[in-house]
């Protein structure tokens, strides 16, 4: 299953399959997730080691048993790959690293006014993988405001150095935020020239294209079909690049297919997995296990659940079957692709779904451990769980926020439905940033069921929580995916990085905002909060947040939306925007429904008809 815990001051011994430099443990974990054989990783921050060569070292590891011995190493961070972790799988990495220079091939230098602009330039340059920006206080005047666009053979820095007044980061192309746009066209009977960066075997051009999309240096590809004239080159997928970023020439060639990486697509990237099953095809590779199962779909599920399994073949040969079950061969290779592909067989083959974003219906397993007033504009995909709850009577208007917590579930505030309990009048918009982008053609979700907490009473602040079951499940994308729920009764975690988001009023007597707003607000103890609200009872099932001096808060229209906190690199839904005295008033914090206190209720209500939990929270 999905294991997200990080081990502080621990280093996994042995099992190395690759090493690289990464700026932090989260990026190292992402590289492990996308490496075909990596199950575990260990990261050495600069502070953890004197050896300059090993600073920022990210060590990717494999293990037949799924684990390795841990040794104590002060400052080191270790953990698991996020394979099998559904919506948490993403190659998108937005963080900016201050005081760090990520080295690589500098191929473009320009003057820009901010690190954000430098990151945008990198994202809009086809060859840029990461960048460094020298701030206005950099010690050498001639380098100030320089934006250096970079690449490297492996897509990660060739070295990382601590350097004052330098900020570094990665391209946001994997976040589907590139302005370049992509070529969806595939060209039949055409071969591209230029430099081959890798060669893998694939059953069709679509798998070849997805592999190209997630390969750090692939810009385009040529695939040789299973009837290509040279037998040894059949099913070969050549991943390619060029100086210009486009093929310098193409040659008409029977039984070849060519196309482009989809990494520069805006708003939608293909999933980093291949779910198609290929009948009459055998995939060869290193044998991991052989098991008897009923049907090819069960074989694929078995492969997906066995974390080291990369692909499989389900044999229908009479000698491989007994009763209704046949042999399911679970296999792996060094590069994650079959080492041999055979056609016209009695088998069906396919790939593990361990890297599919959708995962199962569960929301998230994590480690136990109102426009916004005074806020700023959010950017695409920054808060992909945020939804807008809108009512369509004669006109249509935004009324509340909400948080996507599963394919078919939204968590919001009960008071949003005061006087409007009819599910037919509601429209739920997900994956949006600007309310003005909503037109009559914009897809929306309808409500199947509104589940208001049984103890909620209108115009009281208690138990202000409601679940919405959507009529149809939503697919997950970089712009529309769920937020992890906290552990039941989560009291031990100290959250220091919390944000509230919404399209609500920007002042007490304001109006709904167009662009989703965000504001960073500190949590306030319940004791402190109670002092500020003498006339109300602040219960243990509430959480408060706000600045003593006011000025930043949720407001009308943000209700039901999320209060999220980042801990150990993972966002969790800590609160639901509920109520407050005015908005952003001095010494009047916002009051939020404490989600951790309602975990039993959430899990009980989201049980599917077959008894399987539709969301999963930490044990």
């Amino acid at each position: 299953g999905c294991l997200t815990q990080l081990y502080e001051n621990a280093f996994f011994r042995g099992g190395d399959v690759a090493s690289m430099y990464t700026p932090n443990a989260q990026y190292c974990q992402m590289r492990c997730t996308f490496h075909p054989r990596c199950l575990l990783f260990s990261f050495l921050p600069a502070s953890s080691i004197n050896d300059m060569e090993k600073r920022f070292g990210c060590f990717l590891k494999d293990s037949v048993t799924g684990t390795l011995p841990k040794v104590h190493r002060t400052g080191a961070v270790s953990g698991h790959s996020l394979k099998q972790c559904g919506h948490q799988i993403s190659a998108c990495h937005r963080d900016i690293y201050k005081g760090v220079d990520m080295r690589g091939v500098n191929f473009n230098v320009s003057k820009v006014s901010s690190v954000e602009e430098c990151q945008k330039r990198c994202t809009s340059n086809i060859r840029c993988q990461f960048f460094s920006y020298a701030t206005q206080t950099f010690h050498k005047a001639e380098y100030r405001n320089n934006c250096l666009l970079k690449y490297s053979p492996g897509g990660t820095p060739t070295a990382i150095k601590v350097l004052s007044n330098v900020e570094s980061g990665f391209s946001l192309k994997p976040c589907a935020l590139s302005e370049i746009g992509c070529h969806m066209n595939i060209f039949q009977h055409l071969a591209f020239s230029d430099v081959d960066v890798a060669r893998v075997l694939t059953p069709d051009a679509f798998v070849c294209r997805t592999i190209c999309t997630y390969h750090p240096n692939c810009l385009f590809f040529t695939f040789y079909t299973n009837v290509w004239k040279i037998e040894s080159q059949r099913n070969v997928c050549l991943l390619k690049t060029s100086e210009s970023g486009t093929p310098s020439s193409s040659t008409p060639q029977e039984n070849t297919i060519s196309g482009y990486s989809l990494l520069t697509c805006k708003r939608t990237l293909p999933e980093p997995c291949h779910s198609k099953i290929y009948p009459g095809v055998d995939f060869g590779g290193e044998e991991l296990n052989v098991t008897f199962v009923k049907g090819v779909n069960v074989c694929q599920e078995t492969c997906t659940k066995m974390i080291r399994c990369q692909f499989f073949t389900y044999s229908l040969l009479p000698e491989d079957c007994k009763e209704e079950k046949c042999k399911c061969f679970l296999r792996l290779s060094m590069d994650g692709s079959p080492t041999r592909i055979a056609y016209g067989t009695q088998g069906s083959s396919g790939y593990s779904l361990r890297l599919c974003n959708t995962g199962d219906n569960s929301v998230c397993t994590t480690k136990t451990s109102t426009r916004i007033v005074g806020g700023t504009n959010s950017s695409w995909g920054e808060w992909p769980w945020q939804v807008s709850l809108q009512v369509k009577l004669t006109a249509q208007r935004h009324l509340c926020g909400g948080s996507l917590i599963g394919h078919q579930w939204v968590l919001t505030a009960a008071h949003c439905f005061d006087g409007l309990p009819l599910q037919d009048v509601w429209r739920i918009y997900s994956g949006i940033l600007n309310l003005s982008d909503i037109t009559k053609d914009t897809p929306f979700s309808q409500i199947k069921e509104i589940i208001i907490h049984q103890n909620y009473k209108v115009s009281e602040g208690n138990h202000d929580i409601a679940l919405i079951k959507l009529q149809a499940p939503l697919n997950y994308t970089e712009f529309q995916k769920p937020i992890c729920l906290p552990s039941k009764g989560d009291t031990s975690t100290i959250y220091t990085n919390c944000w509230v988001t919404g399209w609500g009023f920007s002042k007490e007597k304001g109006e709904i905002q167009n662009i989703l707003q965000k504001v960073n607000i500190p949590l306030v103890t319940n004791e402190e909060c109670q002092k500020r609200y003498q006339d109300y009872k602040i219960t243990q099932r509430m959480v408060c947040a706000g600045y003593k001096e006011g000025g930043k808060d949720a407001c009308k229209g943000d209700s039901g939306g999320p209060l999220v906190c980042k801990h150990n690199g993972m966002w969790r839904l800590v609160g639901i925007t509920s109520w407050g005295e005015g908005c952003a008033r001095r010494e009047q914090p916002g009051v939020y429904t404490k989600v951790a206190e309602y975990m039993d209720w959430i899990l009980e209500k989201t049980q599917s008809s077959d008894g399987k939990a539709q969301m999963q929270s930490p044990a």
Partner: antibody, heavy 118, light 107 residues
Framework: EVQLLESGGGLVQPGGSLRLSCAAS????????MEWVRQAPGKGLEWVSS????????IYADSVKGRFTISRDNSKNTLYLQMNSLRAEDTAVYYC???????????WGQGTMVTVSS | DIQMTQSPSSLSASVGDRVTITCRAS??????LNWYQQKPGKAPKVLIH???TLESGVPSRFSGSGSGTDFTLTISSLQPEDFATYYC?????????FGQGTKLEVR
């Protein structure tokens, strides 16, 4: 010119049999998956069966499984559909089609009519 | 089996109009989606494969887009010869299934 030409259709009684043929020309027949698709009068398209280039792998729609058999003779550049235990609901125009490199049915025959009636 | 749902089932339009036909798959099919045109008494003809790749010889006024479950066929400026029935089809998994068709008629 790339071409597919079906033959063998006609009127047959329920429970009867018929063998359809599809002659291919203008391309390397043994390089491609081949398909049979049918269309009942006034209705939409329904995929019937598929065969791999070597003939080693065959797939059928549930509606015809156990009654129809797809085969090919690469030396004769010909695709076949043996239809047994025919029913009234099998009445349709039957098309043979080539599955192209990108899995679309890129070349179609002109179709042959099969009528199952007593 | 994967169900393919086309909308609308029929459409009246005039020469020069921009026309859009949508196709929804009951589960994600990546870009394994093809569009066909069929005229009365004739065999279908492929227009677009892999969701957006135009078949050679097909006029550029035809375009396709989409991935996953939602797909669109657009005719940017309708010509007299475009009045026909259009089908989408998934080639993601067997049984390969077609949409029920969209009949494009003269207004």
């Amino acid at each position: 010119e790339v071409q597919l030409l079906e033959s063998g259709g006609g009127l047959v009684q329920p429970g009867g049999s018929l063998r359809l043929s599809c002659a291919a020309s203008g391309f390397t027949f043994s390089d491609y998956d081949m398909e049979w698709v049918r269309q009942a009068p006034g209705k939409g398209l329904e995929w019937v069966s598929s065969i791999s280039p070597s003939g080693g792998s065959t797939i059928y729609a549930d509606s015809v499984k156990g009654r129809f058999t797809i085969s090919r003779d690469n030396s004769k550049n010909t695709l076949y559909l043996q239809m047994n235990s025919l029913r009234a609901e099998d009445t349709a125009v039957y098309y043979c089609a080539r599955q192209g490199l990108l899995t679309a049915f890129d070349i179609w025959g002109q179709g042959t009519m099969v009528t199952v009636s007593s | 089996d994967i169900q393919m749902t086309q909308s609308p089932s029929s459409l009246s339009a005039s020469v020069g109009d921009r026309v859009t036909i949508t196709c929804r798959a009951s589960q994600s099919i990546n870009t394994y989606l093809n569009w066909y045109q069929q005229k009365p008494g004739k065999a279908p003809k492929v227009l677009i494969h892999a969701a957006s790749t135009l078949e050679s010889g097909v006029p550029s006024r035809f375009s396709g887009s989409g991935s996953g479950t939602d797909f669109t066929l657009t005719i940017s400026s309708l010509q007299p010869e475009d009045f026909a029935t259009y089908y989408c089809q998934q080639s993601y998994s067997t049984p390969y299934t077609f949409g029920q068709g969209t009949k494009l008629e003269v207004r």
